[in-house]
Amino acid sequence: TIPPHVQKSVNNDMIVTDNNGAVKFPQLCKFCDVRFSTCDNQKSCMSNCSITSICEKPQEVCVAVWRKNDENITLETVCHDPKLPYHDFILEDAASPKCIMKEKKKPGETFFMCSCSSDECNDNIIFSEEYNTSNPDLLLVIFQ
């Protein structure tokens, strides 16, 4: 993936389609790589990432990774191709429009990851699957 400040626009000459034949265009994702976070013991959190990037490739989706160890909590936001593993895990939920966190086994830390395929969907990370209603006040974001 190209750096977040390099905005990639859709490539009209190399059309990528999904299983239904719909054109897949590069999506907008939060892209701050790894940042310290205060998100803990909450049903959902905002990324607090101010960088909205256009993903390099049409097939890429938004990803968020939440990690907690004895020292700190971090949140990673990126674009990534779901055909490729990320942190050694397959992105099972890449077609989801929302970023629903799922716990993964990692020694020495608590590790949650989610992926999703709607614009800027990794800005709101959801830890509780019952938490499915959009709260506009919570989800308002500023573009850059």
């Epitope: 400040h5 390099v6 905005q7 990639k8 626009s9 859709v10 009209n12 999904d18 719909a22 054109v23 897949k24 265009f25 590069p26 999506q27 907008l28 256009i54 429009p97 929302k98 395929s117 709607s118 614009d119 800027e120 969907c121 800005d123 709101n124 959009s134 709260n135 506009p136 006040d137 919570l138 989800l139 308002l140 974001v141 500023i142 573009f143 850059q144």
Partner: antibody, heavy 116, light 107 residues
């Protein structure tokens, strides 16, 4: 193939209202931020506003000249974007384009003429 | 809002000429600068994104440069199909504002 087709343009008197529609096809509309951009006759391009996805609350942003008068909405079940224009002024006369926000897909445009 | 100022507003050139259009932002926009080409009666077409990256399918005679507040679009050898109006646009902040345009006409 991505298609964005605007409709609803026409002649309206100052102070009147008009609703533009943009029918989208060929892509996952519900996943995308969408924008409206306008161009007055013989003038440059002017961004009007955007709507984010319903999944992120459907938040909208507007350019200063239309804030409080224009609203943007979307119907993901119909793959359609709307621009509701109220309290229209003569300076709102323009071709209005529907666009996939920050990406290079545009409709053909629809002309709105505000005149008495 | 960030103001985008293009110069010149119009220019006359001949086929084969090297043409340069500049765009200045009222504050730093990093590399969040796009260049569009528009022909009469048509929707704009993206030429350059992120200040210097060529959009797929756009001829290599088009190039962009700059960062911060000053940006340039260069057409190395003007072709008949390049006579059009060119716009810069910043996508650094909302609203994503356009320059006023530069019309490239046949001399």
């Amino acid at each position: 193939q991505v298609q964005l087709v605007e409709s609803g343009g026409g002649l309206v008197e100052p102070g009147g209202s008009l609703r533009l529609s943009c029918a989208a096809s060929g892509f996952q509309f519900s996943n995308a931020w969408m924008s409206w951009v306008r161009q007055a006759p013989g003038k440059g391009l002017e961004w009007v506003g955007r709507i984010k996805t319903t999944y992120s609350g459907g938040a909208t942003d507007f350019a200063a000249p239309v804030k409080g008068r224009f609203t943007i909405s979307r119907d993901d079940s119909k793959n359609t974007l709307y621009l509701q224009m109220n309290s229209l002024k003569t300076e709102d006369t323009a071709v209005y384009y529907c666009t996939l926000d920050l990406r290079d897909y545009w409709g053909q445009g629809t002309l709105v003429t505000v005149s008495s | 809002d960030i103001q985008m100022t293009q110069s010149p507003s119009s220019l006359s050139a001949s086929v084969g000429d090297r043409v340069t259009i500049t765009c200045r932002a009222s504050q730093s926009i990093s590399s969040y600068l796009n260049w569009y080409q528009q022909k009469p009666g048509k929707a704009p077409k993206l030429l350059i994104y992120a200040a210097s990256s060529l959009q797929s399918g756009v001829p290599s005679r088009f190039s962009g440069s700059g960062s911060g507040t000053d940006f340039t679009l260069t057409i190395s050898s003007l072709q008949p199909e390049d006579f059009a109006t060119y716009y810069c646009q910043q996508s650094y902040s909302t609203p994503p504002t356009f320059g006023q345009g530069t019309k490239v006409e046949i001399k």
